[in-house]
């Protein structure tokens, strides 16, 4: 959790002199309560936006927007504290809008935005906007909070961000699996344009339960440059037990940018459907899976209207 260092954030607007300051997340008005305090923010919205750094890297950011209520308490509004809490690590980052002039009612509702909190793929955040000064201990709360779930690297716009590309999001291995004679499974995939080793992991399950009944790992040595984008083949000898037939294959790359922590791709091969009229044949209708670093959901966001991405769980 960090702030974009470029461009410098701005909170001033027509009719308001304002500066953005780093904050300890503990405003002075908590320690020295005031009698008159402003009301809470209205219509807090958080959206996924993207921003370039000076170095040209692209990062996901939380775009925070809120408006003021149309009451007289704006006369006592001295600023706002913006707080982002990363749920899984309890890390918190705050900034403060410090108003250098008094707000006045004007013909349109006051609106504020901030887009400098850099967020991580597949993480959940609690975003809070606190109007300042904060209320006395028993006063009505004058903050608004919302949760914000950042999509994982499967999401179309996220895929091209620097943190996702660093974990191998642009590599599409196009894994294919076919069953051969004599309890064998052949896995093929496309190598990426880096001389890096790969690992292919096979785990087999019975059709009725999700307990593993067989697993094996095969290493693929770093390809030479002329082998980049070529297909690699690995053949596994399967368990002799016919009921150990539901296979989960993962391909794990070890790219230099992510080492042990690169995005994996996977496919599942279901147990064959046995019927009196069909002859067993090679499995072609495997289910492709994308294995991000943790679970994901379906998303829609401002920058990607109308396209949601479905993740097959297993």
């Amino acid at each position: 959790l960090r702030l974009l260092d470029f461009p410098a954030p701005v909170c001033a607007q027509e009719g308001l002199s304002c500066r953005v300051k780093n904050s300890t997340c503990l405003d002075d008005s908590w320690i020295h309560p005031r009698n008159l305090t402003p009301s809470s923010p209205k219509d807090l919205q958080i959206q996924l936006h993207f921003a370039h750094t000076q170095q040209g890297d692209l990062f996901p950011v939380a775009h925070i927007e809120w408006t003021l209520q149309t009451d007289a308490s704006i006369l006592y509004l001295e600023g706002a504290e913006l707080s982002v809490l990363q749920l899984n690590t309890n890390e918190r980052l705050c900034v403060r809008f410090e108003f250098l002039s008094k707000l006045r009612h004007h013909h349109r509702r006051w609106r504020f935005t901030f887009s400098h909190f850099v967020v991580d793929p597949d993480q959940e955040y609690e975003v809070t906007v606190h109007h300042l000064p904060k209320p006395i201990p028993d006063g009505d709360p004058n903050h608004q909070s919302k949760n914000f779930l950042v999509p994982d690297c499967e999401h179309a716009r996220m895929k091209v961000t620097t943190p996702c590309m660093s974990s191998g999001s642009l590599w599409d291995p196009n894994i294919t699996v076919e069953t051969l004679e004599a309890h064998q499974l052949r896995v093929s995939f496309t190598l990426w344009n880096e001389s890096t080793p790969y690992q292919v992991l096979l785990e087999s399950f019975s059709d009725s339960e999700n307990h593993s009944c067989f697993d094996v790992v095969k290493q693929i040595f770093a390809p030479r440059q002329e082998e980049f984008h070529q297909r690699a083949n690995v053949t596994f000898t399967l368990s002799k037990f016919h009921w150990c037939c539901h296979h989960h294959v993962q391909v794990q790359p070890f790219f230099s940018s992510c080492l042990n922590d690169c995005l994996r791709h996977a496919v599942t091969v279901p147990c064959p459907v046995i019927s009196n009229t069909t002859v067993p044949k090679p499995v072609a209708d495997y289910i492709p899976l994308w294995e991000p670093r943790s679970g994901s959901s379906d998303y829609k966001d401002d920058d990607d209207k109308g396209s949601s991405h479905h993740h097959h769980h297993h």
């Epitope: 690590t89 309890n90 909070s145 949760n147 922590d261 670093r293 943790s294």
Partner: antibody
Framework: EVQLVESGGGSVQPGGSLRLSCAAS????????MNWVRQAPGKGLEWVSI????????HYADSVKGRFTISRDNAKNSLYLQMNSLRDEDTAVYYC???????????WGQGTTVTVSS | DIQMTQSPSSLSASVGDRVTITCRAS??????LAWYQQKPGKFPELLIY???TLQSGVPSRFSGSGSGTDFTLTISSLQPEDVATYYC?????????FGPGTKVDIK
């Protein structure tokens, strides 16, 4: 001294309800997300639920979803777990735990025992 | 949901031995992994967070390593007071699942 103290445990019949409380002291409670974790007799740890500092994010383990409700009162430095439709398998020691900045849970209560039995 | 497995489920070692416990996630979790020690009748105590960062006050004989799916907790020289059950926990995203635990005792 940073401290968490759970209360509200006891014996209840299957289908019954209990409300657990966790009183926090020695730290700025309103700045932290808070967790409930349980441990059945002779078994391992099971994460139950988390609530963010301002209650805008709440998650539950699948095993308790729809039956348990986590809540907090920052003014009272208190965390709660309302447990309804209790089952035999909910019998456990229930701990409240504070997450460490950076990850993991570094402050735990002593636990309160819940026994569900007919 | 991501499953966590630990091995071995129990072990016996002599005082001074090097002890290694492994934890595996069914999908990559980056370095969002913590290790806990729980002594009989006590609450768990945080040993390691972020896969390899030692919690303050924890003896330096404990160390953690790994990233992605495979993680290790090492006790470089087992002491009598280390008899306990050790749990890993993933915290990349909810649910923040624990591993089943590894019971360590002295031969």
């Amino acid at each position: 001294e940073v401290q968490l103290v759970e209360s509200g445990g006891g014996s209840v019949q299957p289908g019954g309800s209990l409300r657990l409380s966790c009183a926090a002291s020695g730290f700025t409670f309103s700045s932290y997300s808070m967790n409930w974790v349980r441990q059945a007799p002779g078994k391992g740890l099971e994460w139950v639920s988390i609530i963010s500092s301002r209650s805008s994010i709440i998650h539950y383990a699948d095993s308790v979803k729809g039956r348990f409700t986590i809540s907090r009162d920052n003014a009272k430095n208190s965390l709660y777990l309302q447990m309804n439709s209790l089952r035999d398998e909910d019998t456990a020691v229930y701990y409240c735990a504070r997450p460490k900045v950076g990850g993991g849970m570094d402050v735990w209560g002593q636990g309160t025992t819940v026994t569900v039995s007919s | 949901d991501i499953q966590m497995t630990q091995s071995p489920s129990s072990l016996s070692a002599s005082v001074g031995d090097r002890v290694t416990i492994t934890c595996r996630a069914s999908q990559g979790i980056s370095n969002y992994l913590a290790w806990y020690q729980q002594k009989p009748g006590k609450f768990p105590e945080l040993l390691i967070y972020a896969a390899s960062t030692l919690q303050s006050g924890v003896p330096s004989r404990f160390s953690g390593s790994g990233s992605g799916t495979d993680f290790t907790l090492t006790i470089s020289s087992l002491q009598p007071e280390d008899v306990a059950t050790y749990y890993c926990q993933k915290y990349n995203r909810a649910p923040f699942t624990f591993g089943p635990g590894t019971k360590v005792d002295i031969k």
